[in-house]
C-alpha cells in the first residue's frame, strides 16, 4: 500500500494549528471498517492518534490532535495538530493498514518570529570619538536559534568583537543577545539583523551616532 506524505517539512508557527498531510489510495469498495490508521512519533514510537474498527480512537497526544473523518474514506489520513509547541517539532509517522500495509514519515518544523531588536549602548553618556562601546542587540521569543549579523552604515559587515548568546525559555523559545564591541567614529550607524533561518524573517535594529553631544536613546 502506497502512503504519501510531503517531502518538505511542514512549517508551523508556535501557537497555530498545523496539518500533517498523509494520503493513501483506497481500492474500489473500500470500507472504513477495514482501515487501521496510526500516527506516532517516529523516534520514540509514542502513539499520537489512531483510527481502528471504523472508529476514531482519539488523541493520545495531549488532546491536541484530530483526524479529518469526512475525508478518510477518500484516502485522506491527515492529522491536525492544534496549538503547536516547540516540543512538537520532529518526525511523525503515518501507518496505514487495510489488507496491505504502508507507512511514511513527515517532519514538523516549528518556528516563531523574533521580535524587533532593542538596541542598548554602554557607555551611553558623554561619549567621544575613540571611545570603546558595547552595543547590545536583543531580540526575543523566536525559534529556532537565530543567525545574527552586524553591519555599519555603509552595509559593511562587522564580524570582529561580536559575542552572541541565545537562551531558551520554559516554552523553548529563544531570547538572543548579541554584543558588538566597537570603537566609535565621529559619525556612524551600527545595525543588527536577527534572522530566523526557517521563516527567512529578518528583524532589524540600529543605533545612529550623529556627532556630539553623543547620547544614544534606543530607537523606537
Amino acid at each position: 500500500l502506497e502512503v504519501q506524505v510531503p517531502e518538505d517539512p511542514v512549517v508551523a508557527l508556535v501557537g497555530t494549528d498545523a496539518t500533517l498531510c498523509c494520503s493513501f489510495s483506497p481500492e474500489p469498495g473500500f470500507s472504513l471498517a477495514q482501515l487501521n490508521l496510526i500516527w506516532q512519533l517516529t523516534d520514540t514510537k509514542q502513539l499520537v492518534h489512531s483510527f481502528a474498527e471504523g472508529q476514531d480512537q482519539g488523541s493520545a497526544y495531549a488532546n491536541r490532535t484530530a483526524l479529518f473523518p469526512d475525508l478518510l474514506a477518500q484516502g485522506n489520513a491527515s492529522l491536525r495538530l492544534q496549538r503547536v509547541r516547540v516540543a512538537d517539532e520532529g518526525s511523525f509517522t503515518c501507518f496505514v493498514s487495510i489488507r496491505d500495509f504502508g507507512s511514511a514519515a513527515v517532519s514538523l518544523q516549528v518556528a516563531a518570529p523574533y521580535s524587533k531588536p532593542s538596541m542598548t549602548l554602554e557607555p551611553n553618556k558623554d561619549l567621544r570619538p575613540g571611545d570603546t562601546v558595547t552595543i547590545t542587540c536583543s531580540s526575543y521569543r523566536g525559534y529556532p536559534e537565530a543567525e545574527v549579523f552586524w553591519q555599519d552604515g555603509q552595509g559593511v559587515p562587522l564580524t570582529g568583537n561580536v559575542t552572541t548568546s541565545q537562551m531558551a525559555n520554559e516554552q523553548g523559545l529563544f531570547d538572543v543577545h548579541s554584543v558588538l564591541r566597537v570603537v566609535l567614529g565621529a559619525n556612524g550607524t551600527y545595525s543588527c539583523l536577527v534572522r530566523n533561518p526557517v521563516l527567512q524573517q529578518d528583524a532589524h535594529g540600529s543605533v545612529t551616532i550623529t556627532g556630539q553631544p553623543m547620547t544614544f536613546p534606543p530607537e523606537a
Epitope: K125, R128, P129, T132
Partner: antibody, heavy 119, light 108 residues
Framework: EVQLQQSGAELVRPGASVKLSCKTS????????IHWIKQRSGQGLEWIAR????????FYNEKFKGRATLTADKSSSTVYLQLNSLKSEDSAVYFC????????????WGAGTTVTVSS | DIVLTQSPAIMSASPGEKVTLTCSVS???????LYWYQQKPGSSPKLWIY???NLASGVPARFSGSGSGPSYSLTISSMEAEDAASYFC?????????FGSGTKLEIK
C-alpha cells in the same frame, strides 16, 4: 550629593609603583565616567585618562599610556589610578574628577592626592 | 592634540576694573564642551563656566563667558578681591582632553 574621597599622600622611590584611590558616592557608580587629572606644583592641569565603571571602558592620554592604569571596583564604588616606573616628574597632585554633560551638568573634584617621588 | 593657549599668563586688576581672559584653541571644538575652572592655592579646581557661556552654580553674575572657535573668553565686569585666582580653560570635546596653561589673576 556626588562626593569623591581620595586616598592620602604618598612618598615613593623612583622606579616604584603607586596606586591611588578615589571612593565615590551619591550617584550610580556604573553609569558615569571618572577622570584623573595631574597637576605639578604651581603648574597647569593635565588630563590623564577616564574610565566608565559599567563596562570598564577606558581612554588614555597617549602621554600616560603604558605607565598609568585605571581600574574600577564596583563593590566599593572606587576607582583606582596605578602609576608605574615612577620618575621625579611624576611628583604632583592627582585629582579624580566626575564630570557629565549628558543628562545633567555636573562637575565634582576630589581633594587631590599628593605623590612625591624621591630617593 | 588640541592646544589651548591662554593669555595673559599673569595679570593684575584693580577692584571694579573689567577683566577679560582669553583662550585660543588650535583646532575646532564643540562649544558645549569648553569649560572654565577657577583654582585657588591648595584647593581643587572649581567649575566656573560650562558650555562656553553658562555660569556654574554659585558663580557671581559679574562673570560671563563667550566665544566660538578659535577664541573663547571669560569676562569679569567688575573685579573684586575674591576673584583673585588662577583660571583654566578646558576642552573635553576631543581626545585627549586638554587644559590651557592658565591665567593667574591678581588684585592690585
Amino acid at each position: 550629593e556626588v562626593q569623591l574621597q581620595q586616598s592620602g599622600a604618598e612618598l615613593v622611590r623612583p622606579g616604584a609603583s603607586v596606586k591611588l584611590s578615589c571612593k565615590t558616592s551619591g550617584y550610580i557608580f556604573t553609569s558615569y565616567w571618572i577622570h584623573w587629572i595631574k597637576q605639578r606644583s604651581g603648574q597647569g592641569l593635565e588630563w590623564i585618562a577616564r574610565i566608565y565603571p559599567g563596562t570598564d571602558s577606558t581612554f588614555y592620554n597617549e602621554k600616560f599610556k603604558g605607565r598609568a592604569t585605571l581600574t574600577a571596583d564596583k563593590s566599593s564604588s572606587t576607582v583606582y589610578l596605578q602609576l608605574n616606573s615612577l620618575k621625579s616628574e611624576d611628583s604632583a597632585v592627582y585629582f579624580c574628577h566626575f564630570i557629565t554633560a549628558s543628562d545633567w551638568y555636573f562637575d565634582v573634584w576630589g581633594a587631590g592626592t599628593t605623590v612625591t617621588v624621591s630617593s | 592634540d588640541i592646544v589651548l593657549t591662554q593669555s595673559p599668563a599673569i595679570m593684575s586688576a584693580s577692584p571694579g576694573e573689567k577683566v577679560t581672559l582669553t583662550c585660543s584653541v588650535s583646532s575646532s571644538v564643540n562649544s558645549n564642551y569648553l569649560y572654565w575652572y577657577q583654582q585657588k592655592p591648595g584647593s581643587s579646581p572649581k567649575l566656573w563656566i560650562y558650555g562656553t557661556s553658562n555660569l556654574a552654580s554659585g558663580v557671581p553674575a559679574r562673570f560671563s563667558g563667550s566665544g566660538s572657535g578659535p577664541s573663547y573668553s571669560l569676562t569679569i565686569s567688575s573685579m573684586e578681591a575674591e576673584d583673585a585666582a588662577s583660571y583654566f580653560c578646558y576642552q573635553w570635546s576631543s581626545y585627549p582632553f586638554t587644559f590651557g596653561s592658565g591665567t593667574k589673576l591678581e588684585i592690585k
